[in-house]
C-alpha cells in the first residue's frame, strides 16, 4: 500500500496517506467527428473522443478506450462535460433529407457511470433542454460538472440524445474531463 | 526547487514533491463596467476584471494585470468563467441609438491562452449560442469550465462577441477564475 | 492546530501544513420534492436537498442541515449547482389552475452564503435567464460553479426564483455541491 508521510488529523482516527497532486489521475478529452453507430431506440448513443492531440490528454493511469474513461483508483472525482449542439431548419439541409428532423424537441447530455459488476448504468449528470429556436440556424452548449465518489474500474461515458446534432468542429466547444480531487 | 516531503508511488518511478494546498495559485475575478476599446473586426474583445474587491481575489503568485491572469507555475489548472449577456429590443434603447443592434444573432464567450513566445492565442474553451429571444428584454448566462495543462508564464483572458451586451451589474453574474489542481 | 508535515516554500515565509486529500470536507446533494414554504415577496426561496441517498453524500465534517451546507473549516472551496426548470403552458396545467403563471418571464438560481455574525446573506453566484419558450412544454438547466474563500461556520444554500418550476424528478438534473480545494 502507498505509504507516504502519514498523520492523524484530530477529527478522524484513521491514518490518511499524503499524496503528490501531480500524480493524480486526470483527463481532458475533446470532440472528434462521430461515426454513426447502431443504438437501441430508447438508449442515447455515446460519444467518442480525442485523448491525446491538441488540448486533449490523459495522465497518471487514467485511460481512455472505446468511448470510456477508465477510473484507475477509488476516490472523489470532479467530472465535467460540455456538448455544443447545432442544427439547421433549412428544408434542403442534408440532415433533413436523410429523414431526421434537425429541429428536435429537445437536446440532452448525460454523463453515465458503468460498473462491470452491475448491469445497469448509473446516470450521474443530465443536462436537458427543450428547443424552441425560431431561426434557421441554431446552436447552443449544455455544460455539466459535479463531484462523485467513484471506484477503481468504473467507466465514464457521455451520451447524447442525437449524435448528428453534436458540433465536432472545434475542440473548445465539445469536451469531457475528470480529475481525482 | 521546491522539495517538501517526497515519496515514490508504486506506479511511477519519479519522486513527486508533496505540496500544501493553501499554497497553490488561485484566482476568482469578478465583472466590472467595461470601457469600450478598439478591437480588430474578427477578433473578440477581452474583458477586464475586478481582482481584489468583494468576492474577487488572487493569491499565491497568481496575478491579474491588464485583462490577463498570469500563470505563475506549470501544472494542471481548472479554469472557469460565466458571462451573463443581456439586451433590449426596444427601439429607444441607448445601445440601439448608438447604431449597434442589440439583438445579436449569437453570443459567444471564449477563454483564451496567450504564450509570450508565440503570437497566436490558443482557444481553450468556447461557449456559443444563437439568440432567438422574442421578448423585448432578454438575458442569459454562458458558463464554461475545464482542466488544462498550463506553463509558467502563460496568460489567460476571457473574450466575448460583444462587450456592450455583458451584464456588469453584479459580481455574481459574470466572473472568471482558475486554480492549480 | 493540525500539524502534519510542514515545509516552507521559497516564495512564502509561513509554514503550511500538508494535508491528506481524502480528509477534506466535501458534499454533493441531490434534488428532492420541495414542500412549498412561506417566503417574503422579494426573497427567493431556498431548496432543500437529499444528502445521503443515491449519489448524494457529505463527508469529513461537511454537514447538511435545514437547507444549508455547513462549512466546517476555513479555506478555498469550489461550489457548484445545477437547477433544471420546467413548465407547461397548457391551460389545464395543475400549476396554472393554482393561479401561478408557469411561463415565467425569467428563471434564476442563486448560491448564497450566510454568516451568523453578519445579518445580510452574500450572493456568491447567480444564473438568470429570460424565458421566451414558445412550445407548450419547456425545460432547461442553469449551471453555476466557482471558487470562494469561506470561513468555518459559513452556511451555503441554493435559492430559486420559483420553487414550483424546479424539476425534482431525477437526482442527475438538479444538484448542489462543494469541496475544499
Amino acid at each position: 500500500a502507498l505509504k507516504g508521510q502519514e498523520f492523524a488529523p484530530s477529527h478522524q482516527q484513521v491514518y490518511a496517506p499524503l499524496r503528490a497532486d501531480g500524480d493524480k489521475p486526470r483527463a481532458h478529452l475533446t470532440v472528434v467527428r462521430q461515426t454513426p453507430t447502431q443504438h437501441f431506440k430508447n438508449q442515447f448513443p455515446a460519444l467518442h473522443w480525442e485523448h491525446e492531440l491538441g488540448l486533449a490528454f490523459t495522465k497518471n493511469r487514467m485511460n481512455y478506450t472505446n468511448k470510456f474513461l477508465l477510473i484507475p483508483e477509488s476516490g472523489d472525482y470532479f467530472i465535467y462535460s460540455q456538448v455544443t449542439f447545432r442544427g439547421m431548419t433549412s428544408e434542403s439541409s442534408e440532415i433533413r433529407q436523410a429523414g431526421r428532423p434537425n429541429k428536435p424537441d429537445s437536446i440532452t447530455v448525460v454523463i453515465t457511470k458503468v460498473t462491470d459488476s452491475y448491469p445497469e448504468p448509473t446516470q450521474l449528470l443530465m443536462g436537458t433542454k427543450s428547443v424552441s429556436e425560431v431561426g434557421s440556424n441554431w446552436f447552443q452548449p449544455i455544460y455539466l460538472g459535479a463531484m462523485f465518489s467513484l471506484q477503481e474500474g468504473d467507466k465514464l461515458m457521455v451520451n447524447v440524445s442525437d449524435i448528428s446534432l453534436v458540433d465536432y468542429t472545434k475542440e473548445d466547444k465539445t469536451f469531457f474531463g475528470a480529475f481525482l480531487l | 526547487a521546491l522539495k517538501g516531503q517526497e515519496f515514490a508511488p508504486s506506479h511511477q518511478q519519479v519522486y513527486a514533491p508533496l505540496r500544501a494546498d493553501g499554497d497553490k495559485p488561485r484566482a476568482h475575478l469578478t465583472v466590472v463596467r467595461q470601457t469600450p476599446t478598439q478591437h480588430f473586426k474578427n477578433q473578440f474583445p477581452a474583458l477586464h476584471w475586478e481582482h481584489e474587491l468583494g468576492l474577487a481575489f488572487t493569491k499565491n503568485r497568481m496575478n491579474y494585470t491588464n485583462k490577463f491572469l498570469l500563470i505563475p507555475e506549470s501544472g494542471d489548472y481548472f479554469i472557469y468563467s460565466q458571462v451573463t449577456f443581456r439586451g433590449m429590443t426596444s427601439e429607444s434603447s441607448e445601445i440601439r441609438q448608438a447604431g449597434r443592434p442589440n439583438k445579436p444573432d449569437s453570443i459567444t464567450v471564449v477563454i483564451t491562452k496567450v504564450t509570450d513566445s508565440y503570437p497566436e492565442p490558443t482557444q481553450l474553451l468556447m461557449g456559443t449560442k444563437s439568440v432567438s429571444e422574442v421578448g423585448s428584454n432578454w438575458f442569459q448566462p454562458i458558463y464554461l469550465g475545464a482542466m488544462f495543462s498550463l506553463q509558467e508564464g502563460d496568460k489567460l483572458m476571457v473574450n466575448v462577441s460583444d462587450i456592450s451586451l455583458v451584464d456588469y451589474t453584479k459580481e455574481d453574474k459574470t466572473f472568471f477564475g482558475a486554480f492549480l489542481l | 492546530a493540525l500539524k502534519g508535515q510542514e515545509f516552507a516554500p521559497s516564495h512564502q515565509q509561513v509554514y503550511a501544513p500538508l494535508r491528506a486529500d481524502g480528509d477534506k470536507p466535501r458534499a454533493h446533494l441531490t434534488v428532492v420534492r420541495q414542500t412549498p414554504t412561506q417566503h417574503f415577496k422579494n426573497q427567493f426561496p431556498a431548496l432543500h436537498w437529499e444528502h445521503e441517498l443515491g449519489l448524494a453524500f457529505t463527508k469529513n465534517r461537511m454537514n447538511y442541515t435545514n437547507k444549508f451546507l455547513l462549512i466546517p473549516e476555513s479555506g478555498d472551496y469550489f461550489i457548484y449547482s445545477q437547477v433544471t426548470f420546467r413548465g407547461m403552458t397548457s391551460e389545464s396545467s395543475e400549476i396554472r389552475q393554482a393561479g401561478r403563471p408557469n411561463k415565467p418571464d425569467s428563471i434564476t438560481v442563486v448560491i448564497t452564503k450566510v454568516t451568523d455574525s453578519y445579518p445580510e446573506p452574500t450572493q456568491l453566484l447567480m444564473g438568470t435567464k429570460s424565458v421566451s419558450e414558445v412550445g407548450s412544454n419547456w425545460f432547461q438547466p442553469i449551471y453555476l460553479g466557482a471558487m470562494f474563500s469561506l470561513q468555518e461556520g459559513d452556511k451555503l444554500m441554493v435559492n430559486v426564483s420559483d420553487i414550483s418550476l424546479v424539476d425534482y424528478t431525477k437526482e442527475d438534473k438538479t444538484f448542489f455541491g462543494a469541496f475544499l480545494l
Epitope: V31, E50, E52, L55, Y168, E171, T174 | T122 | -
Partner: antibody
C-alpha cells in the same frame, strides 16, 4: 517564423547511445506533438515515435520499443530523442517534425514543419 | 500495425502530364491519411492532410482523394520542381506508418 532546429551530426560506435535535440520556435510548443522520423541511406521514411509536448505521453514504433526514449523540456521548448544500443543499421538521417493539429474533430493533420535533419553514423 | 502499399514504385512522366499516385491501406484509416513530397537532400514537405486537404502554400495542381483503404494523390500538370519521391502516411492508428514511396521521375 515557425521552425525546428536540430543538433549536429554524430558519429557513434556500435552499442553506444545518441541523443538528438530539436529546438522549436515561432509557435505554441505545448500544443503540437513532435514525431521523430528517420531515413537510412537510399531508403524510405520510417516513423520512430511521437511525444505529446503537452503532457509527455509517448508512442513508439514496435521495432524500436525498449531502445528509444523521447522527452521534452517545455522551459527550453526542446524535444529530445535518445536511441540506445546502436547498431550499424541505425545509420540514418533523423528528423523531428511538428504534428499539426487544427483544433477540430474533423482533422488529424500531418507533419507540417520539419527539422533540417541530423545525420547519425554508427561505425566501429 | 497498418501497412501502406504505394504504387507504382516509379512513375516516369514528362512535364505537363498528369500524375496519379496510389496508396492502399491494409485496413481502414478513415480519412486520416497524409501525403509528403521529398527531394534529394531535403526534409519531407507536407502536401495533403486528411486525404484531401491541401497544406498551407501547396499549389492547386496537387489534390488528394479517397477514404477507407484506397487513396490517390493527383498532380494535374507536372512542373519541373514536382519530380521527387512521394510518401503517404496513415494517422488513424498508432503506430503511424509510411508507405514505401513512389518516385516520380522525368521521362
Amino acid at each position: 517564423q515557425v521552425q525546428l532546429v536540430q543538433s549536429g551530426a554524430e558519429v557513434k560506435k556500435p552499442g553506444a547511445s545518441v541523443k538528438v535535440s530539436c529546438k522549436a520556435s515561432g509557435y505554441d510548443f505545448t500544443y503540437y506533438g513532435i514525431s521523430w522520423v528517420r531515413q537510412a541511406p537510399g531508403q524510405g521514411l520510417e516513423w520512430m515515435g511521437w511525444i505529446s509536448t503537452y503532457n509527455g505521453n509517448t508512442h513508439y514504433a514496435r521495432m524500436l520499443q525498449g531502445r528509444v526514449t523521447m522527452t521534452t523540456d517545455t522551459s527550453t521548448r526542446t524535444a529530445y530523442m535518445e536511441l540506445r544500443s546502436l547498431r550499424s543499421d541505425d545509420t540514418a538521417v533523423y528528423y523531428c517534425a511538428r504534428e499539426s493539429y487544427y483544433g477540430s474533430g474533423e482533422y488529424r493533420g500531418g507533419m507540417d514543419v520539419w527539422g533540417q535533419g541530423t545525420t547519425v553514423t554508427v561505425s566501429s | 500495425e497498418i501497412v501502406l502499399t504505394q504504387s507504382p514504385a516509379t512513375l516516369s512522366l514528362s512535364p505537363g502530364e498528369r500524375a496519379t499516385l496510389s496508396c492502399r491501406a491494409s485496413q481502414s484509416v478513415s480519412s486520416y491519411l497524409a501525403w509528403y513530397q521529398q527531394k534529394p537532400g531535403q526534409a519531407p514537405r507536407l502536401l495533403i492532410y486528411d486525404a484531401s486537404n491541401r497544406a498551407t502554400g501547396i499549389p492547386a495542381r496537387f489534390s488528394g482523394s479517397g477514404s477507407g483503404t484506397d487513396f490517390t494523390l493527383t498532380i494535374s500538370s507536372l512542373e519541373p520542381e514536382d519530380f521527387a519521391v512521394y510518401y503517404c502516411q496513415q494517422r488513424s492508428n498508432w503506430p503511424w506508418t509510411f508507405g514505401q514511396g513512389t518516385k516520380v521521375e522525368i521521362k
